[in-house]
Interface confidence: low
């Protein structure tokens, strides 16, 4: 029987900057029962805190709902695993809220073939971000991906999107049933998940004309 | 070691416009939050503007508000501070900083010199 | 008008005496939890962090230089002055209702 081993915060994620979760991994438990508690404090402040809500994240988390979260200021925290034989902590984590949003993947994909009498033929899609997210403040920007392929192909064909929440695409096959999906990210953070796939099917009179 | 050296100060007529730089070196600059702080002669310590880690977000002391704009190059490991509508109020040896913040060592520019004045 | 106040602003100390400065803010400031840094500023020469986070001491810092901070009050101590040490002390935190950070307006210790 041995104190347990050090853990180590190894993710923190934010959908929208306005609350927060982080994560654990326990060290080795030393063969007893082992007791967590997640410290933090704000740069700037002495005062220590401990995780306000370990259940909201599910095991070996701490999340910080709104009324603990600050974009401002750098929030600094370590996890402490106990058990009868002794303590042991975590390297700190510094962590900007700023920087670690993972938005909820975009929202009301739809896509439609378009095919103008006088030019070429297109796929046009359009898509809403997702909803946590307020655009209107300017403290986001977000970035949009597109991917899309043939239903029975191995490869995705990618396009970026800027900031732009529609996209053509002109080079596709006729009479092919084409998945698509879209993703965002902010400009200082991670991509969020793929939407669900929508299902689009080309017109075998798809003309690919010059 | 940590340096940071300051260029760009100098005399400039009130409603004029300067662009102060403090290149950093001997340490990891996107790590650290980056700071202005000015003297004017004979008087005591202003903090003037804060920018963070990767610079969507800065803080600005309310007498340059709207008038300052502080950014940074990470590429270049470079501060910048870039001073418009100058009144002779702002005449003051101008300080970069790394990490005022708490947990944070800190370090300072020599300071350049700011003079407003027709 | 939000601010830090020293005191005192000037004091006048022989080599191997004892000398406090004191640093007076409000809730939105020291009182606010939020630590306090010391700063000493020879002519000519930027500042330089003496004492950060209330109490702690930077690297290279003699142990004559301490802190304490209690409520809204933040304590600068030099327990045995010596003749380097004659400069301006500036206290500083951060300000939640400024949303930036304040110095205290500088106490300028002389030696006798």
């Known amino acids: 029987q041995l104190p347990p081993g050090k853990p180590e915060i190894f993710k923190c994620r934010s959908p929208n900057k306005e609350t927060f979760t982080c994560w654990w991994r326990p060290g080795t438990d030393g063969g007893l029962p082992t007791n967590y508690s997640l410290t933090y404090h704000r740069e700037g402040e002495t005062l220590m805190h401990e995780c306000p809500d370990y259940i909201t994240g599910g095991p070996n988390s701490c999340h910080f709902g709104k009324q603990y979260t600050s974009m401002w200021r750098t929030y600094v925290m370590m996890v402490n695993a106990t058990n009868q034989m002794g303590s042991s902590f975590s390297d700190e984590l510094y962590v900007d809220v700023t920087y670690i949003v993972q938005p909820d993947p975009p929202l009301e994909l739809t896509v439609e073939v378009k095919q103008p009498e006088d030019r070429k033929p297109y796929l046009w899609m359009k898509w809403s971000p997702p909803t946590l997210i307020d655009l209107k403040t300017g403290w986001f920007t977000l970035l949009y991906e597109i991917r899309l392929k043939p239903e029975k192909a191995a490869e995705w064909e990618t396009h970026f999107a800027g900031q732009q929440t529609e996209f053509k695409i002109l080079s596709l096959h006729p009479g092919q049933k084409y998945l698509v999906q879209v993703r965002c990210k902010p400009d200082h953070g991670y991509w969020s998940a793929w939407s669900p796939a929508t299902f689009i099917q080309i017109p075998s009179d798809f003309i690919m004309n010059d | 070691q940590v340096q940071l050296v300051q260029s760009g100060g100098g005399l400039v007529q009130p409603g004029g416009s300067l662009r102060l730089s403090c290149a950093a070196s001997?340490?990891?600059?996107?790590?650290?939050?980056m700071h202005w702080v000015r003297q004017a002669p004979g008087k005591g310590l202003e903090w003037v503007s804060d920018?963070?880690?990767?610079?969507?977000?800065?803080n600005y002391a309310d007498s340059v508000k709207g008038r300052f704009t502080i950014s940074r190059d990470n590429a270049k490991n470079t501060l910048y501070l870039q001073l418009n509508s100058l009144r002779a109020e702002d005449t003051a040896m101008y300080y970069c900083?790394?990490?005022?913040?708490?947990?944070?060592?800190?370090?300072w520019g020599q300071g350049t010199l700011v003079t407003v004045s027709s | 008008d939000i601010q830090l106040t020293q005191s005192p602003s000037s004091v006048s100390v022989s080599v191997g005496e004892r000398v406090t400065i004191d640093c007076t803010g409000s809730?939105?400031?020291?009182?606010?939890?939020?630590?306090v840094h010391w700063y000493q500023q020879k002519p000519g020469q930027a500042p330089q962090l003496k004492i950060y986070?209330?109490?702690q001491r930077p690297s290279g810092v003699p142990d004559r230089f301490s802190g304490s901070k209690s409520g809204t009050d933040a304590t600068l101590t030099i327990s045995s002055l010596q003749a380097e040490d004659a400069a301006v002390y500036y206290c500083?935190?951060?300000?939640?209702?400024?949303?930036?950070?304040?110095f205290g307006q500088g106490t300028k210790l002389e030696i006798k």
């Open positions: 900083a790394r990490g005022l913040d708490a947990r944070r060592m800190s370090y």
């Open positions: 500083a935190a951060w300000d939640d209702s400024l949303n930036g950070w304040l």
């Open positions: 920018i963070s880690r990767l610079s969507p977000y800065t």
């Open positions: 809730s939105s400031n020291i009182g606010h939890g939020y630590v």
């Open positions: 001997g340490f990891s600059y996107s790590d650290y939050w």
């Open positions: 986070r209330n109490n």
